[in-house]
Each structure stands twice: as structure tokens, then as C-alpha cells.
Amino acid sequence: IWELKKDVYVVELDWYPDAPGEMVVLTCDTPEEDGITWTLDQSSEVLGSGKTLTIQVKEFGDAGQYTCHKGGEVLSHSLLLLHKKEDGIWSTDILKDQKEPKNKTFLRCEAKNYSGRFTCWWLTTISTDLTFSVKSSRGSSDPQGVTCGAATLSAERVRGDNKEYEYSVECQEDSACPAAEESLPIEVMVDAVHKLKYENYTSSFFIRDIIKPDPPKNLQLKPLKNSRQVEVSWEYPDTWSTPHSYFSLTFCVQVQGKSKREKKDRVFTDKTSATVICRKNASISVRAQDRYYSSSWSEWASVPCS
Amino acid sequence: RAVPGGSSPAWTQCQQLSQKLCTLAWSAHPLVGHMDLREEGDEETTNDVPHIQCGDGCDPQGLRDNSQFCLQRIHQGLIFYEKLLGSDIFTGEPSLLPDSPVGQLHASLLGLSQLLQPEGHHWETQQIPSLSPSQPWQRLLLRFKILRSLQAFVAVAARVFAHGAATLSP
């Protein structure tokens, strides 16, 4: 058993049929010594008396808010949560496996630049009685500070018969060094509590590996005289690190017909303009990627060809 | 060239070669995103590699003030990786494919380090840790880790030279 926060405790249980469970001793936070009784949740049934209560925690029915009273007055609470371990593996019932970029990916994180600011998100089908707490650091043995905000519900989607909820959190490294080569990864830890179930999820990454620039901005076409070619031009996204002579991007320009079955025309360039062949009903799209490190491409910025 | 007395390197040549190094480093080990090498407990291997750190003056302001600190750090790293790529980690079993970019990568690391340090001028270089994996699978894992680490190193070096070529070239 360990303390998650004040008056909230997590009991770690090996979860299998007829498991013996864990013996837990609760102590009433009071100077009083006599006349103390214990109850669980809203029940008035007295579970025991005395300053301490010893219980055998085996299942969710044994978890909940234990309260010690004296003469009708509440003295203190202890909330017990369960953390299940099945076949040596901690349960991951609360969050959905996003399976990208690999299986058992529950947390996904992205950064728009090298400033040390990043966003993480996760998915669940649970809509109520759900709380999240996020902590982060750079490195684990001698951790350096990363400050995370509160996790918020950022999107709701319907997936077949189910509703899916996306939560996200923004974090900022306290003393970021955008130009340095990272040697210690960022660690992100999410505590998830659903009713009386506790789970924790972690992710470890370098900012450079989660970089995904915003799409190029100000995408414009200039038709070339007496030609079916157009000059496409664009600018670096505002959110990208500066100066651009140091934090450079490379770009992919794509001409795509109205159908996915049409062949694409792609041009790769380090410049912020390119000349491509335009055709009726096609669209021109541009996306960006760090020029020197192959992290994610941005989403496309698009304009119609005509 | 970064010669004694602190005159400028051939920024544009360094830029071109460092960008080529980035391309080669990724073509030598493109599937890195699909292997979480940090899970493999790599403290004893990649903790020893020279990283370009915050105080090394490789940021735009540091380069403007005095690029020599940064160039020396880059040079150390280039020599370090050049020696690693020439070691039995890469020359031993399992053999690299004949068309593997590792050979080109090795040559380009040497080329860039020579651009930074002409003959007769010596910066101190970092000791290469004695990494002698006994099993071929250990060697393979070590190669992946070294290339992964090299990708990060050459990305910073390429940014330095791109910025230098754009703003510090005479």
C-alpha cells in the first residue's frame, strides 16, 4: 500500500481467483483513543472499533472511503483504491491502446517545435467518475523539472456504438535548451482513477522524436505565363522554432487529383517555393518536416489548382 | 577551416557535408522509430557518447559570440563516431550488406572532421569506450543505438553549419 495523495491510498493486488489479497491497517487521524468506530462509504454498518482497523483487501468491494467516527462526528477519511496486477502485468483497463506507432501505446505526445513545450493525449471510453493526474520530468535518476497543466477533455468522438473521449495535457520543460542534443529522455507519468480502480501509464521520449511541425502557412499559387505550371510559395509556420537559418525545415509539395486513384506528383525542396504542373480538379498541398532529423511530417496545407 | 587562432571554417562546405551526413545516418538505420532502443538498457553504451550540450555554445547566440567552442565539440563527436564506425562493432559479424551506407557515413564523418581540423592543429579528442560485444545480436543492437545517437548528433551539427553558412560566412 502507498499514499497517492493525502488520505488516498493505493493497494496493489495480485489479481487471480481466490487470491489472498493484502492485509491493510488503517489508522484514524485523531488524538482520540476511545469510542472510535469505522464505516465504509455511505453504509452505516460498523466495521470495527478502535483507533486502527485491520482489513483484508481482496476485491473492489473492499475498497472505498473508510471513515472513522466518534459520537456521530467524522474524525478522518481514508480512500482505498485498487491497482490490479494480472499475470505480473499491471492492468490497463481505463485507457485505450492507440496502437500507433506500436502496440501498447496509451499515451501519445507531440511537440510543434524545440521550445520544450509538448502536448500528450490519450483515449478512453469511460465518461464518468474519472480523474487524471500528470507528472513529468527530464530523466529519472536525477530528474529535471517539467511542468504540466491539468488534463482536460479535448474531444469526443463516436466510434461505432461507443463514444470515445480524448483527454490532453500540455507540459513545458522548465529550463529547455532548444539547440542542445538531448541525452536524457522526457518521462511522462499519468495516474488514472476510475471509481475505485487506479492505473498508471508512462511514456518516455526525446522532444526531437515527437516533433511535428504545424502546416506551412500562407500557401499561394502564381500561374506561369503561357504554361500549365504554377509557382507555389509558402512560409514557415509561426509556431516553428527560430531562427529558421538554424531550425530549418524541408518541404514536400504534392499535386493530387480529386480521386485517390490518380497518380500524385511530388516535389521535395528545402526552399519555400516550387514549380509544379497544375491540372484541372487537382489540389496542391505542402507539408513540412525537420530538415535534419526525420521526425513526423506536418499535416498538409492545401489550395485548389485552378 | 577551423584553424588555430580561431578563424572561420568553410561554412558552406561543412553545411553540405553535414546535411549529407544526416541523410546517410537515416538511410543507414531508417526504421529507428519502430524500435524503442531505450528499453534495452543502454546506459553502458550510449551514455559515453559525446553530446552537444547546453553550455557548448552551439546555439545561434553562442555561435555568434565564439563558434570555436562549438566547433571543437562537434569535432570531438565526429572523431568519436568515426572511430566507432570503423571498430569491430561495425566490421564484425553480422557483416554489413555490400551497399550499406555505413561505409559512406564513415568516410563522410572523417571528411567533415578534416574540414574542421587541418593537419598540424589538434584539439583534444574524447576516449572511445572499449565496447566489445561478444554476441552478434549484441553487436547488432549496439549498431542501432550508435546510429540512433549519431542521427541526433549530426542533426545538431547540420543546424550549426547551416546557420553558420547563412549568417557567419565572410
Partner: antibody, heavy 114, light 106 residues
Framework: QSLEESGGRLVTPGTPLTLTCTAS????????MTWVRQAPGGGLEWIGT????STYYASWAKGRFTISRTSTTVDLKMTSLTTEDTATYFC????????????WGPGTLVTVSS | LVMTQTPASVSAAVGGTVTINCQAS??????LAWYQQKPGQRPKLLIY???TLTSGVPSRFKGSGSGKQFTLTISGVQREDAATYYC?????????FGGGTKVVVV
């Protein structure tokens, strides 16, 4: 407006050969350009296409045939030629992409023989 | 992608009708064109986007179909229509000619 292929000749097996397509009356760089071949007495066979810089090839042509362009020409570079590659090679202009070929050259004959 | 063209050859009287079929091995929407080639000449585009007639091509040539099944119909065949006709289909990675249909006008 017209297209003309050049470079076709008699070569021995294994010899590399480059064919060139030039345009009159319009700018090649404004169009997707395609190479097609036809063996003596045979049907038409699509080799590949070049857009602005993207290239597409028939599966049998990948690795052995390379299409490239300059502002005024489109080249077809062929390596490891065999007698099976004996054919008339046409270059053609795509109206939109590479299936609606509205302008064709007269073709150039490549003969591979030992 | 495979384009199967039938028949391999067909005879028609002047004024008659010829129908040539082309079947794609997968859905290519309307990315199909028809070409006419006479002996010793370069191919000529007749129809593109499955049914759009190229300018200058007589209206007796008609293209139809989409997806996997396509047809070229020549109504009121003329002597000058004697030639080999090819379909050409395209998807997002490749482009393939049909085997050709030789039209003999009797």
C-alpha cells in the same frame, strides 16, 4: 506541336542506352511525359511516366529503366538490355496525367542483337 | 493492374457497329482511354476519362463504362476505321494497356 524521339540504334545485349524526347511548339516541363514501347508486330506496352519530378514505372521496368527530365528534354535510360527489349520506343504527352496521351512522337527503333 | 481487352479481332461491314470491351482487374473509376493505331503509325488518342471524345475525333466513336467494365463502340463503321484499338487504364501506381483489338472492315 510535335514530339520527337532520338537515340535508337542497334546495340548488343547488356549495353546501356539513353533515348531522348524533345518537343516543338510547347514546353515539355508543363506536362506529364510517358514512354511506351511496341515490339515488332506486338501491342503497346507502358514503360513509365515522369510528372514534375515524381516517376512511375511498370513493374518489369523498375530498376532497369530510368526516366528523367531537363527543362527541354525527357530521357529514358535503359540498362542491361536484352533481345526482348527490341522495340519501337515512343514518348507521349499526357493531357492530364499519364493515361490520356494526346500527343505522340513517331517513335525510335531500338534493336538489341548479338 | 491488368487490363483484359476482348475480342482480339473483329470484322465489320461498312456502316455496321463494332463493340470492344476492356475489363480492369480493379476499380479504376474513369481513368481509362482508348487509342487507335494504324500500321506503321503512331497511336492516336480517341477517348479519355472513359467517355470524353478528343477534339477532332468523329462522333461515331463512343466510350462508356466506369469502375471495372469499359466499352468502345464504333457506330456506322467507315473504311478508315480499320486499325488496332487499345484501351489504357491507370491507377495510383501503374498504367497498363489492354492487348489490343484488330478491327477489319469488309
Amino acid at each position: 506541336q510535335s514530339l520527337e524521339e532520338s537515340g535508337g540504334r542497334l546495340v548488343t545485349p547488356g549495353t546501356p542506352l539513353t533515348l531522348t524526347c524533345t518537343a516543338s511548339g510547347f514546353s515539355l516541363s508543363s506536362y506529364w511525359m510517358t514512354w511506351v514501347r511496341q515490339a515488332p508486330g506486338g501491342g503497346l506496352e507502358w514503360i513509365g511516366t515522369i510528372a514534375t519530378s515524381s516517376t512511375y514505372y511498370a513493374s518489369w521496368a523498375k530498376g532497369r529503366f530510368t526516366i528523367s527530365r531537363t527543362s527541354t528534354t525527357v530521357d529514358l535510360k535503359m540498362t542491361s538490355l536484352t533481345t526482348e527489349d527490341t522495340a519501337t520506343y515512343f514518348c507521349a504527352r499526357g493531357l492530364t496525367t499519364d493515361y490520356d496521351l494526346d500527343l505522340w512522337g513517331p517513335g525510335t527503333l531500338v534493336t538489341v542483337s548479338s | 493492374l491488368v487490363m483484359t481487352q476482348t475480342p482480339a479481332s473483329v470484322s465489320a461491314a461498312v456502316g455496321g457497329t463494332v463493340t470492344i470491351n476492356c475489363q480492369a482487374s480493379e476499380d479504376i473509376e474513369s481513368y481509362l482511354a482508348w487509342y487507335q493505331q494504324k500500321p506503321g503509325q503512331r497511336p492516336k488518342l480517341l477517348i479519355y476519362s472513359a467517355s470524353t471524345l478528343t477534339s477532332g475525333v468523329p462522333s461515331r466513336f463512343k466510350g462508356s463504362g466506369s469502375g471495372k467494365q469499359f466499352t468502345l463502340t464504333i457506330s456506322g463503321v467507315q473504311r478508315e476505321d480499320a486499325a488496332t484499338y487499345y484501351c489504357l487504364g491507370a491507377d495510383d501506381t501503374t498504367t497498363v494497356f489492354g492487348g489490343g483489338t484488330k478491327v477489319v472492315v469488309v
